[in-house]
Interface confidence: low
């Protein structure tokens, strides 16, 4: 083994370096000392380090490690944070456009149903947005409420436009009749299926992205143990105590130290891999009725078809409802 | 079906939306995200190696520091000796993850379970028997397009509808990521973020 270069006889170099870490030179010995009080940089001979210097080195080593960890995750963090924001905004845009398309459909095809229809459509899509963001709302209830609200307007404005104002207290009966008579056929059920499936998937997708951010943030801000700090100090700074300012740690040694310091973090690996693969599986399944973009942007068409369905059966319906709701005071459906 | 211009509405034309291959859609954006995430699949297992490659380590030098002394880079002492008389590295590993890490692992387990539950088997399509009950209803042809809506009377066939994200103010090219200057092509077990 080659002899080490002679240590700096005056600790001058060590002082110059240490001054960057800690202004004020009182902690650095003028000349090498025995260093019997050192706990990490255990000296084989005279040393240019003091106990206080060692403590400062440990603190710096842990800070270095935290910074390295943060720079390691910077691109990954940026990727997930930006995508979470983009998808959240994208989903909001889809909802907004779906609402606009549905309103446009009513405006162009059923002007007599506006502005009430706009109000019901607005409430429905507000609930859709809230659901995506995690609200505890039942999708079937949302769809039922939309059709329950629409039917009385359709009945009084499209099917029975000559109905006198005095008959308008039958709304509650009409809401009940809507379900009992399945006046919109299977369309509400179809919409429930499509909307609930697509929104569930959308919601879990956003939740998964947000958890991804939480995982990175957690490991990003880990505080390393004192043991780890000592190992890092020994690897990065103890050579300075011997005046060896330019030497670098051995690669294999660094790997061993890092595996020790990172032991806890590396345990995430298995679940992180599974997270990415599960997310991929989810994304691969986000098509057709599991794709909210596809479903919500087509809702205006399905709602239009459901109204056409009612109109097609208007004759039969009007007769039946006429009987059912003639005495709506006595007979409440709900 | 609901197609706005009045003349077309009366004609009840079926509208086939042109399939756009190259424009950006939400689903293509999702797939792109997954591809990028997959390059980070070994992120946590590769961390120790990353940290070493981004902190001072003897690469071309003949001599290196093993925690106690200067040794030749390829000698056995380069990795081993520095760990003696220090503290028990095995013990450090055995302590197990910090509570905060255990907590995040639990959350990951939970979301993974949810994601697996939600992942739908491919090829499953919407039941098309709309005319089971109620008065009467049209049906949907079983072609490649998703059939949205149900009146047989001029349905809208919807294909890849939305060249999306034109409206978003974000540009997610990884080149724009902070600190992402010269990115090497990541190998399978590398972390793509690491730059020397």
């Amino acid at each position: 083994q080659p002899p080490p270069p002679p240590p700096d006889a005056t600790c001058h170099q060590v002082r110059s370096f240490f001054q960057r870490l800690q202004p004020g030179l009182k902690w650095v010995p003028e000349t090498p000392v025995p260093g019997s009080d050192l706990q990490v940089c255990l000296p084989k001979g005279p040393t240019c380090c003091s106990r206080k210097m060692e403590e400062k080195y440990q603190l710096t080593a842990r800070l270095n490690m935290e910074q390295l960890l943060q720079s390691a995750s910077m691109e990954l963090k940026f990727l997930i944070i930006q995508n979470a924001a983009v998808f959240q905004e994208a989903f909001e845009i889809v909802v907004r456009h779906a609402k606009n398309y549905t309103n446009a459909m009513f405006k162009n095809n059923y002007p007599s149903l506006t502005p009430q229809a706009f109000e019901f459509v607005g409430e429905f899509f507000t609930d859709v947005s809230l659901y995506i963001l995690g609200s505890d709302i039942n999708v079937d209830d949302m769809v039922n409420e939309l059709f329950d609200s629409l039917f009385p307007v359709i009945y009084t404005q499209l099917m029975n436009p000559g109905l006198p104002d005095s008959a308008l207290d039958i709304n509650e009966c009409l809401r009940g009749a809507r379900r009992d008579l399945k006046v919109f056929g299977n369309f509400p059920k179809l919409i429930m299926t499509q909307v609930s499936k697509s929104l569930q998937v959308t919601r879990i997708f956003l939740q998964a992205l947000n958890l991804g951010i939480e995982v990175i943030n957690t490991t990003d801000h880990l505080k390393f143990s004192k043991d780890c700090g000592r190992m890092l100090t020994r690897m990065w700074y103890c050579s300075y105590c011997q005046g060896l300012m330019m030497v670098k740690p051995c690669g294999g040694y660094c790997n061993v130290v890092m595996q020790g310091c990172m032991a806890g973090v590396v345990e995430i690996d298995k679940y992180w891999r599974e997270y990415i693969l599960s997310l991929e599986e989810l994304v691969n399944g986000m098509y057709r009725i599991y794709d909210m973009e596809n479903v919500l942007l087509g809702l205006f068409s399905t709602i239009h078809d459901s109204i056409q369905y009612v109109q097609k059966n208007a004759g039969k319906l009007t007769t039946t409802i006429g009987k059912l709701c003639a005495h709506s005071q006595q007979r409440q459906y709900r | 079906s609901a197609y706005y211009p009045e003349d077309l509405f009366i004609d009840k034309k079926v509208l086939k939306v042109a399939h756009v291959e190259h424009e950006e859609t939400l689903s293509s954006r999702r797939r792109e995200l997954i591809q990028k995430l997959k390059s980070f699949i070994s992120f946590y297992s590769a961390l120790p190696g990353y940290i070493c490659s981004h902190s001072p380590v003897a690469e071309n030098d003949t001599l290196c520091w093993n925690g106690q002394e200067l040794v030749e880079r390829y000698s056995q002492k380069a990795a081993r000796n520095g760990m003696k008389n220090q503290f028990n590295l095995h013990e450090l590993k055995m302590k197990g993850p910090e509570p905060v890490v255990s907590q995040i692992i639990d959350k990951l387990k939970h979301i993974n379970q949810l994601l697996r539950t939600m992942s739908m088997p491919k090829g499953r399509v919407l039941d098309k028997n709309l005319d089971e009950e109620g008065f009467e209803s049209g049906d949907c042809g079983d072609d490649e397009d998703e059939c949205i809506g149900g009146s047989g009377d001029g349905m809208i066939k919807v294909k890849n509808q939305l060249r999306f994200l034109a409206e978003l103010a974000y540009d997610l090219d990884v080149d724009d990521a902070p600190g992402n200057s010269q990115q090497a092509t990541p190998k399978d077990n590398e972390i793509s973020t690491f730059h020397n």
Epitope: N100, N103, A104, K107, N108 | Y3, Y4, P5, L8, K13, L15, K16, A18, V20, H22, E23, R163, A166, E167, A169
Partner: antibody
Framework: EVQLVESGGGLVQPGGSLRLSCAAS????????MSWVRQAPGKGLEWVSG????????YYADSVKGRFTISRDNSKNTLYLQMNSLRAEDTAVYYC?????FGLGWMHYYYGMDVWGQGTTVTVSS | QSVLTQPPSVSGAPGQRVTISCTGS?????VHWYQQLPGRAPKLLIY???NRPSGVPDRFSGSNSGTSASLAITGLQAEDEADYYC??????????FGGGTKLTVL
Amino acid sequence: EVQLVESGGGLVQPGGSLRLSCAASGFTFGNYAMSWVRQAPGKGLEWVSGVSGSGDGTYYADSVKGRFTISRDNSKNTLYLQMNSLRAEDTAVYYCAKEYDFGLGWMHYYYGMDVWGQGTTVTVSS
Amino acid sequence: QSVLTQPPSVSGAPGQRVTISCTGSSSGYDVHWYQQLPGRAPKLLIYGSNNRPSGVPDRFSGSNSGTSASLAITGLQAEDEADYYCQSYDSSLNAIFGGGTKLTVL
């Protein structure tokens, strides 16, 4: 480079006809709705007509309905405006514009017009 | 027929901030803004109420509240002197333009 070039403008007498063309390049023409917008001398912009990407949806401003016909030939990447029964008030610079429409084939004229030609001048005068 | 109303003219000194309003967008659709430099074709400046196409400086921004929208230009420059038009859609989803606003840089 995405480009639109109009042609076919000129001087025509009231009651006469003109056919404007707009040659498109640099983008997948058939994927986008297109519009004609005009600007009378010293006046503002007025939307005239629009057509869906496939060509089967056509739309007109009230002021030109029944007189103008919009069409497109996707194989030639060209948009047309056939103008009949021209009036003095049709005098304007006519621009063709590409709709920035998210590619929703069934929902056009929604996101603004992101590419415009340089315009062609139509003068209706006796 | 829906109408979008803009002030006929606005002016400002170089470096100042000016805003152009656009009212009457009652159909609930987004408002887009165009810049038309003298003798040139219009150019899309802001789409979807507040998004800039690539190449448009961030000095230009849009905002929307209810039935009115506005275009703000900060750090006014001589080359900003132009006509500005807002555009939206009527209930039949046909494009409608505002009357235009002439911006003069003093």
